[in-house]
Amino acid sequence: MMTGTIETTGNISAKKGGSVILQCHLSSTMAQVTQVNWEQHDHSLLAIRNAELGWHIYPAFKDRVAPGPGLGLTLQSLTMNDTGEYFCTYHTYPDGTYRGRIFLEVLESSVAEHSARFQIP
């Protein structure tokens, strides 16, 4: 039985050329997290964080994606094309798979409000 829940940074906005932290948090379960996959809106993988082998950044993003903080992901040098949905998929044992969604809007303006449902330490 899957008892866990995923909290995410929800809908966020960031400035073009800047960076943003994509963060998910799995709670209310004792399941072991074996791997976290980060996907972009077109289902292309950005990065994988394997519990045993560590972080793996996909080649297309290796110059502008940084691992962390924690199981989160930092997306740098933002472009307008980065606007869209991002998904964190938690593969756990024995529960199975949990999935969270974040919507990122990249803004042209010089001032971008960066709002989140929970504070990132």
Epitope: L45, E52, P59, K62
Partner: antibody, heavy 123, light 109 residues
């Protein structure tokens, strides 16, 4: 579909270093989902995994061989290589390179293999 | 390390018969991490089954895999002449390291 081809000397002297290269064609080893591995098979015996590497250079090794093994990658040549030091007759085997789906979780396996190359350790 | 014990060592059967190959692990293995391979003389192994029960691309449906925990089975429902070969199971954990079973030879009776 990626194809893999091993190359290297077929004869190595005891105490020397065995060096093999695997060249990928029909696809890039700079793939996010796959590691690239080495497996060996002594004559008439079973299979033994040696180690695997990611395009970025991250590796994981068989602990029983780790002290003697180095696996490296050259994405510009679409190749990865194996070095096994201080070889003895016990290292005589067919050496295979293969695509390692360790990050694929429910598809973890070696799904594509080279044809293998025989390496004999003898003086 | 996880030791995979395959039995029997050799299976003598005739074409058309059913083959049942066993792979027993020394400790529990996630079924997601269990694979089966076929190897013919002078050839590289070929992936048959991954995730304990999923057939790899191009593998005929006479091959099936099952099992969980420490006991896994490869079944060939009706042996064809090209199926006579050596079969290996493999567990794909990182720590402890991935290992192969010792193999089962399926030979013509």
């Amino acid at each position: 579909q990626v194809q893999l081809q091993e190359s290297g000397p077929g004869l190595v002297k005891p105490s020397q270093t065995l060096s093999l290269t695997c060249t990928a064609s029909g696809g890039s080893i700079e793939s996010g989902l796959y590691y690239w591995g080495w497996i060996r098979q002594p004559p008439g015996k079973g299979l033994e995994w040696i180690g695997s590497i990611y395009y970025s250079g991250s590796t994981y090794y068989n602990p029983s061989l780790k002290s003697r093994v180095t696996i490296s990658v050259d994405t510009s040549k679409n190749q990865f290589s194996l070095k096994l030091s201080s070889v003895t007759a016990a290292d005589t085997a067919v050496y295979y390179c293969a695509r390692d789906g360790v990050l694929a979780l429910n598809k973890r396996s070696f799904d594509i293999w080279g044809q293998g190359t025989m390496v004999t350790v003898s003086s | 390390e996880i030791v995979l014990t395959q039995s029997p060592g050799t299976l003598s059967l005739s074409p058309g018969e059913r083959a049942t190959l066993s792979c027993r692990a020394s400790q529990s293995v996630s079924s997601s991490y269990l694979a089966w391979y076929q190897q013919k003389p002078g050839q590289a192994p070929r992936l048959l089954i991954y995730g304990a029960s999923s057939r790899a691309t191009g593998i005929p449906d006479r091959f099936s895999g099952s099992g969980s925990g420490t006991d896994f089975t490869l079944t060939i429902s009706r042996l064809e002449p090209e199926d006579f070969a050596v079969y290996y199971c493999q567990q794909h954990t990182v720590r402890p390291p991935l290992t192969f079973g010792g193999g089962t030879k399926v030979e013509i009776k």
